[in-house]
């Protein structure tokens, strides 16, 4: 059976204060079944950024309905960036389970916030 | 504000068990991976443990098979279980919120565990 | 693991003077290097990280610089509330996190 892939498209995205961002993931496979989250960094120390779940994530919503049977966008939208969300972004798949088992990150994509036009 | 309280330091005898807890506020908990820091008096600091955002669990090498880090979402509450409990972890313990950088940009005021016979 | 060695181990320096002291780590780490500031009986208050980047509330007198195995924090004008233990860490290779074993800044 054909590896599933995790496909983050943009390598970098530019956006400018105060608007909103929209960071990109399909996956290629509905197999195996699991949850995706979005985290920013990498290792120990990455923070959540969004889990349909479970969580608080007042500033972001999901492009797609995620909960739509057969659903392979799990593209996200955070509303109103600051200068502080810049930074890698990743889209990750995990295998259901308890706990849930990490299978396959994209590659990430950059966030850069460029200063609001005056 | 973000705020870190740790609690449940004290004296125990080598070979005893301790717990300690760390309060967390101010933030969302379960969006950041935590950690504890420790520093034995007069000394400089020593990581210790951290738990991830999806309860993956890391050790220092002195620790390892001793203690046990864990979280409670919920409660917006991290642990430290410490058993088998030597002289050389007298300490003072830190908990601390990580960063996406994976650097501790917010503290507690430290519990204190005292390791003597 | 990588080991972090600053020097020097205490600085005396007078209120108003610069202060520059450093931090070698054993393999590369790129520009992933954090400063922390520890007054007695405090915690530790994270300064600086990715070698040059204030973190937040942090005054503008504190500076960092190098990259790849050697570093530096400055204090372009030491306050009165600057005399503290300087602590570097790295954040590249984990686990487990590093730190050095601290500079000492003490009024001359």
């Known amino acids: 059976e054909e590896e599933l892939q995790v496909i983050q498209p943009e390598k970098s995205v530019s956006v400018a204060a105060g608007d909103s961002a929209t960071l990109n993931c399909t996956v290629s496979s509905l197999i195996p079944v699991g949850p995706i989250q979005w985290f920013r960094g990498a290792g120990p120390g990455r923070e959540l950024i969004y889990n349909l779940k479970e969580g608080h994530f007042p500033r972001v919503t999901a492009v797609s309905d995620p909960t739509k049977r057969n659903n392979m966008d799990f593209s996200i939208r955070i509303s109103n960036i600051t200068p502080a969300d810049a930074g890698t972004y990743y889209c990750v798949k995990f295998r259901k389970g308890s706990p849930d088992v990490e299978l396959k990150s994209g590659a990430g994509t950059e966030l850069s916030v460029r200063a609001k036009p005056s | 504000d973000v705020q870190l309280v740790e609690s449940g330091g004290g004296l125990v005898r080598p070979g005893e068990s301790l717990r300690l807890s760390c309060a967390a506020s101010?933030?969302?908990?379960?969006?950041?991976?935590v950690t504890w820091v420790r520093q034995a008096p007069g000394e400089g600091l020593e990581w210790v443990s951290l738990i991830s955002v999806t309860g993956t669990t890391y050790y220092a090498d002195s620790v390892k098979g001793r203690f046990t880090i864990s979280r409670d979402n919920s409660k917006s509450t991290l642990y430290l279980q410490m058993n088998g409990l030597r002289a050389e972890d007298t300490a003072v313990y830190y908990c601390?919120?990580?960063?996406?950088?994976?650097?501790?940009?917010?503290w507690g005021l430290g519990t204190l565990v005292t390791v003597s016979s | 693991e990588i080991v972090l060695t600053q020097s020097p181990g205490t600085l005396s320096v007078s209120p108003g003077e610069r202060a520059t002291f450093s931090c070698r780590a054993s393999?590369?780490?790129?520009?992933?290097l954090a400063w922390y500031q520890q007054k007695p009986g405090q915690a530790p208050r994270l300064l600086i990280y990715d070698a040059n980047t204030r973190a937040t509330g942090i005054p503008a007198r504190f500076s960092g610089s190098g990259s790849g195995t050697e570093f530096t924090l400055t204090i372009s004008s030491l306050q009165s509330e600057d005399f503290a233990v300087y602590y570097c860490?790295?954040?590249?290779?984990?686990?487990?996190?590093?730190f050095g074993g601290g500079t000492k800044v003490e009024i001359k």
């Open positions: 860490q790295q954040h590249t290779d984990w686990p487990p996190y590093t």
């Open positions: 393999q590369t780490v790129g520009s992933k």
């Open positions: 601390a919120k990580v960063t996406w950088k994976n650097v501790f940009d917010y």
């Open positions: 101010g933030f969302t908990f379960t969006n950041y991976a």
